[in-house]
Amino acid sequence: GGTAEKWEETELDQLFSGPLPGRLPVNHRPFSAPHSSRDQLPPPQTGRSHPAHTAAPQVTSTASKLLPPVAFNHTIGHIVLSEHKNVKFNCSINIPNTYQETAGISWWKDGKELLGAHHSITQFYPDEEGVSIIALFSIASVQRSDNGSYFCKMKVNNREIVSDPIYVEVQGLPYFIKQPESVNVTRNTAFNLTCQAVGPPEPVNIFWVQNSSRVNEKPERSPSVLTVPGLTETAVFSCEAHNDKGLTVSKGVHINIKVIPSPPTEVHILNSTAHSILVSWVPGFDGYSPLQNCSIQVKEADRLSNGSVMVFNTSASPHLYEIQQLQALANYSIAVSCRNEIGWSAVSPWILASTTEGAPSVAPLNITVFLNESNNILDIRWTKPPIKRQDGELVGYRISHVWESAGTYKELSEEVSQNGSWAQIPVQIHNATCTVRIAAITKGGIGPFSEPVNIIIPEHSKVDYAPSSTPAPGNTDSM
């Protein structure tokens, strides 16, 4: 027979000190093999795979078919205990001497072999007729995961023998496998919450709790779905799961009512150019609903402006937008608003921002180029272009001079300050054409280049040139 019992001790020699199954002479001491994984028999002493106790007769293959059947002894079929208790149970089998080939006993649970460090031990009790083997299995502080059907397996003469199952049922307080989840809902709109808990023991009954008060007077069998017809303000829901062992309460979840977002904060100007402003902001509270997009509102801050507001829409993330197509050297007021599925937030506080000066929009005028042969320099003169206020303060000019002769091409640029409207450039190549173009520079950038003015640099003293104020592209005037 088999036994099962609960125990409080944890020492191995105490674990397995209970009564042993029958047919064991009192004067025989058992020998044991503790297990870390599979059960193994002790090393053979007479060439057989179980311990020698008497000389076993040789059995032919024909005779082996006539051997009496061997089976595991009956044992306890069902063990019920509470969580965190200790349990032990066993399988036992009597093998006559007539059997030569036996393998160790292995433990299985729910169809899978229990490998690894389990608390199992096998004891052998030899006598004149054969050997009794007891496989003991223990679990300390059982958990729900230890629930299941345990059984033993053993190979005898190449035939697999399986014991009756021992069903271990660990009972405890209800265990939640699905708890209600926090959701954000539209005001006065129905929604569902789900709660599911299991034993054993079953059944498990569910009570719903809203803001510390029970919602249902009669319990519902698990799983339970609560349909809430709608809320007008935030509420906290939880569920109670009851079984014969007691009560477990789920986590409390907040059900939030979706509202419009709070206005964005910390609106900052990250960068300004002549015609664009890069603005950033920190989104306000999203109102329990994801922000969908944002609107950047821009109005001219100058008193003379007509007060019209430009609106630029952008995605809610990143919290960054480059406002483009603005006027140079202008002042703007900027605010941001964002929306979720409920609606638009109020606008952020307005902030002031300015665009920088732009690049000049016109080129210098009346460009003339003379060759000063005695000093071997080009004398370049021009008149200041009409620069608008928003083009910014003139800082100077960029002069591009390209030198071309047979087999030579040289492109150079120089910058001169705004103080004068003339420059002197050393002659780079003789017997060549020099093409001069000039652009005005402000802090906002470089303006367009003037039409090219060409001058022919002679080999020695002969000069071909003409000043030109509005030449055609590539034109060479001669003097």
Partner: antibody, heavy 125, light 112 residues
Amino acid sequence: EVQLQQSGPELVKPGASVKISCKTSGYTFTEYTMHWVKQSHGKSLEWLGGFNPNNVITSYNQRFQGRATLTVDKSSSTAYMELRSLTSDDSAVYYCTRGDLLWSLLLPGNYFDYWGQGTTLTVSS
Amino acid sequence: DVVMTQSSLTLSVTIGQPASISCKSSQSLLDSDGKTYLNWLLQRPGQSPKRLIYLVSKLDSGVPDRFTGSGSGTDFTLKISRVEAEDLGVYYCWQGTHFPWTFGGGTKLEIK
């Protein structure tokens, strides 16, 4: 370590030309402007001109416009200053000095943070 | 061109004592970008100039904190809280606001 190594002293005759070099190391040559400063004996400093190797733009103090030419050799990270039609007034120590990178040499800034050891130019017959 | 004036040609100081060097510009050095491009250099005897301070008061790396720069508009000052032997040389102010960039005439700091 940023270094600006200038060529050795020069003794030249009036009316001649001179070309001084400034070999740089320890930084990316095209990411900074290069400037030249004149220091006459016992006198103060005078900005002569600057070169932006990034967009190959030069700019000169008008006192030297037409007589000075600034060039660079990007492959060797070397800057050059050529001065023509020399007179005794050009006798001085000439320094190369690193400026910051600006899209225009005319704009404010140009913090001269590293200087060469100087090249002494003597113009004498 | 902007004229930079350093009124003291020579300043005689005792080691360990404070020193103050002034610099005036003929125009305000405050640029439209809000920055003031006033810088200080030190040229020790027989050496090339070395930058000490830029943007009026920002110390270059490796410059001792006994140096401080101050001022705005057209009036600027370089102060040394306790002069040390290595501080001797000629101090130049120069401006990078108005093209072309111009230097002060220099103030020589010498031992009394």
